[in-house]
């Protein structure tokens, strides 16, 4: 059956979000990144549950800390300045979850490193894309 245009748009937005998150993860994992050890000391809150677009609220709330850690890296690995990357992500997240959402994010008890955090949200995006395909 043909995919609806709204579903296609959601898929493309998720793909764009994935691209940005994978770009950050690649930059962090780059073997030339000398600040990786320090970056891994920063802790991020993880969602208790992330299965629907509304759960992107949990990602949105962690974007400021993410930007701060990326600024620390001062790396050319990210292809864009951290501020621009986070701005891109923020715009997409707002479009995907809806700006009028009243969803209250619930966080897991355990915090995570930046790598675990990014992996979690990349997995989330890929999972939603797969269900929409």
């Amino acid at each position: 059956a043909p995919t609806s245009s709204s579903t296609k748009k959601t898929q493309l937005q998720l793909e764009h979000l994935l691209l940005d998150l994978q770009m950050i993860l690649n930059g962090i994992n780059n073997y030339k990144n000398p600040k990786l050890t320090r970056m891994l000391t920063f802790k991020f809150y993880m969602p208790k549950k992330a299965t629907e677009l509304k759960h992107l609220q949990c990602l949105e709330e962690e974007l400021k800390p993410l930007e701060e850690v990326l600024n620390l890296a001062q790396s050319k690995n990210f292809h864009l300045r951290p501020r621009d990357l986070i701005s891109n992500i923020n715009v997409i997240v707002l479009e995907l979850k809806g700006s009028e959402t009243t969803f209250m994010c619930e966080y897991a008890d355990e915090t995570a490193t930046i790598v675990e955090f990014l992996n979690r949200w990349i997995t989330f995006c890929q999972s939603i894309i797969s269900t929409l395909t």
Partner: nanobody, 118 residues
């Protein structure tokens, strides 16, 4: 080292056509999601077109009906056919290839400049 190499950019008049190519090493081609995004000075990066490992395609509203993404698995190459080009399509175009499973490797090229001007 894994590389993606774009080609086909250049100067074209409004209403004209260009075909961009993205040549990859075979290890990152089959099964990977691939796409094209563009960056114009002072603008947000825009994801233009995507093609999955299975061949499903998706386009930004701004290029729908004008651009066509395709891939030739036998040549490890992806293409972006751009027709009815407009001034607002002027940008550096980058191709990328990404894993759809952990460790989520991402590769992208150096970009090719497309200028639409009379």
């Amino acid at each position: 080292e894994v590389q993606l190499l774009e080609s086909g950019g250049g100067l074209v008049q409004p209403g004209g056509s260009l075909r961009l190519s993205c040549a990859t090493s075979g290890t990152i081609f089959s099964g990977y999601t691939m796409g094209w995004y563009r960056q114009a000075p002072g603008k947000q990066r825009e994801l233009v077109a995507v093609i999955s490992g299975g061949g499903d395609t998706n386009y930004a509203d701004s290029v729908k009906g004008r651009f066509t993404i395709s891939r030739d698995n036998s040549k490890d190459t992806m293409y972006l056919q751009m027709n009815s080009l407009r001034a607002e399509d002027t940008a550096v175009y980058y191709c990328y290839s990404r894993e759809v499973t952990p460790p989520w490797k991402l590769y992208w090229g150096q970009g090719t400049l497309v200028t639409v001007s009379s």
